[in-house]
Amino acid sequence: IVLRPSRVHNSEENTMRALTLKDILNGTFSYKTFFPNWISGQEYLHQSADNNIVLYNIETGQSYTILSNRTMKSVNASNYGLSPDRQFVYLESDYSKLWRYSYTATYYIYDLSNGEFVRGNELPRPIQYLCWSPVGSKLAYVYQNNIYLKQRPGDPPFQITFNGRENKIFNGIPDWVYEEEMLATKYALWWSPNGKFLAYAEFNDTDIPVIAYSYYGDEQYPRTINIPYPKAGAKNPVVRIFIIDTTYPAYVGPQEVPVPAMIASSDYYFSWLTWVTDERVCLQWLKRVQNVSVLSICDFREDWQTWDCPKTQEHIEESRTGWAGGFFVSTPVFSYDAISYYKIFSDKDGYKHIHYIKDTVENAIQITSGKWEAINIFRVTQDSLFYSSNEFEEYPGRRNIYRISIGSYPPSKKCVTCHLRKERCQYYTASFSDYAKYYALVCYGPGIPISTLHDGRTDQEIKILEENKELENALKNIQLPKEEIKKLEVDEITLWYKMILPPQFDRSKKYPLLIQVYGGPCSQSVRSVFAVNWISYLASKEGMVIALVDGRGTAFQGDKLLYAVYRKLGVYEVEDQITAVRKFIEMGFIDEKRIAIWGWSYGGYVSSLALASGTGLFKCGIAVAPVSSWEYYASVYTERFMGLPTKDDNLEHYKNSTVMARAEYFRNVDYLLIHGTADDNVHFQNSAQIAKALVNAQVDFQAMWYSDQNHGLSGLSTNHLYTHMTHFLKQCFSLSD
């Protein structure tokens, strides 16, 4: 299936040009998306091209400037947040990145009724997190690991917690491992729907071992960065959940929410919190051995001013074939009765589907079914449930939006997006206004991305929000590679792959092949999305064929494929890449003497193991910021898939699956190892150990470190990285510079 055919014809060839590396590094062909910042059923805010914050009213068709670019510029604001009562806006400036999601910033409050900044009782700086209540204009914020509350922006703050301490106790914000591997947010506090209560997590990292690495900076002596970071098998953070009444915060103070007994009996995690009503909250907990999850619905007891979590409102989700959930355990979407909910989990056939839980999980009503997976529940209204899945035409790498009418019996299903722009758009996400009165669809490809606005009742398209016209015009004289998504059937396993082919691809010729791999559990690389990136350039200009393969362990094709890697990381992911390469060679257009593999992070691990597989298939390869031993990586992630590194659990496979154990096998390949020295995620330690093992085995290899760079290798390092990797590959493939 050719998804992005080249527009090259002989008559046009003179005017067309190939992509250059400079195009990629400059972001010349980047696209824009439009996500409305919904503030009601029919209104959204958006930052205009000239940086005004503009309100759009869909019903009247009119626009209104609510915050001028001058006001934004006066405090160098890079972000804003409107209070729900529309009286105030917070302006965020001095953004300072911490980890993947977390950052600190300075906040100013602007009064929209008088057009002035609020003076008196200003916020301290820098703040770790700040948010408005869902109703009115109360403020909750985290400063120096403690939570504060303001009834109004100009009021003095009320301090909720007092035990916050850097790297020790975190209130309202996650520690490193919860941020990266469990919550995937910078915050750990949640307002109740009407702002009566504020729930928050407290993470105690006192006993967690610390990772320490040098940050070289510009000073005479390097700084040492210390992060409490639990590696596999190490002591984990201790989590507690508290709820405080924000109307009378001093009255009884924070009340702890009890942990279900079956969870509290051994090490556990808190995985998410969902408010149902102002007086009902749903907490999800997970055993440290992550195959048992408990969803606990708790109610406020007015008489005792406490939270009660009856056993009858505990719902257990257990996996017997792998870990609980996909990458994370899914979160519930409650219906209007405030007790029943919709949730995605595995059905009896091992496919993740939407279920409706009214009393017990055992009696759950399955809402979707088939040999495909429901991926996300976007919104549940009185009469409709909107979700995404990869059902359409049996392509796992697509995403379409569906509506199920839950107000009628039997429920009817409609694909909202399947036939909208079928060639251009096969991978969607959506953003809904209040009560799903309107919604935006954001199409990511395979054609040029487009964002559109729709009526939530009729699904009618109202207007195009962003169609990337400039990008379309810029690409008109570019020789883009061809892309195809197909599948290989091997030993009852379906291996979906994406192949990126040079513009003038000729099946009768031989091309060098580069495998790009990620391959981590519950990931997906073969997606019907638009991208003009480094591998596009390698195909367009350098004439390489690039392939991405989703093997065992990858997502959205059922539990059999997903859980195949359970407790055995580093085996089947590598096997499947190798199997695919052999199939590609059989196709006849691959030069089998010029095959390379590269990957980043988990992909660096897989590429390293593939290079060291002893197959002789790969001439060369690159590992960027690879994991080299699962004993070096975070507990929450690693143990989910590998269990514990103990003798009575899975220590043997922890030891067998290291890159270092295969050092000898690198002798016959060209290996480029790359890592940032300030990688807080996959520590430089991983590459240091690979390098040490290779040196000890007297194996030659190439390496590049990026001083003070983290897992993302951003900024100027990106340019250096891709330039360096390009030279390496061209040398490996004997391509002239």
């Epitope: 009601s40 059923g41 205009s48």
Partner: antibody, heavy 119, light 111 residues
Amino acid sequence: QVQLVQSGAEVKKPGASVKVSCKASGYTLTDYNMDWVRQAPGQGLEWIGDIYPNTGGTIYNQKFKGRVTMTIDTSTSTVYMELSSLRSEDTAVYYCTRFRGIHYAMDYWGQGTTVTVSS
Amino acid sequence: EIVLTQSPATLSLSPGERATLSCRASESVDNYGLSFINWFQQKPGQAPRLLIYGTSNRGSGIPARFSGSGSGTDFTLTISSLEPEDFAVYFCQQSNEVPYTFGGGTKVEIK
């Protein structure tokens, strides 16, 4: 301080057009929409329409559709409202009002322009 | 269009008394928890002046004796203690739906 100064009174014959101006000062014209409201003698208030100064985008009361045109001249910070095909029932005081979009509120008003339509 | 009905048409009160003005909408003017009902004061020969916006928020420089309340279809403007300068005509107005509409007004006169 915010000021909206409107043009002077007009007397027009039925079928003619009138163009009322409103000069804004004390704030940046493009930061707020401008609405027009009229008040017939001894009567209530009637909303005519709204203009978004950044693009000149307008919304009009259906009752005036086809007869009203709102325009803007950012160089002079002036907004105009033209009403055509005048009839006697268009006799009224016409007000320009600054419209604070986030609150959908007309927070400052011009002094009014009396338009008399008489044969 | 949304019709706003104000009552009473005239309110005769003495300075210092409490004034309660009513405004009823022909359909709900609630917009997801916010009601775009505004109140204006108009004195003879003058332009209207914004008193209350969004049902209950006082406009710039408006004294605390003026307050607004209500939701759905029923809204109230209250003047807790009438001052001599408060005797005027009061209009309610909705901005929830185009065309924006005004009530017929309540005249507050000296008894």
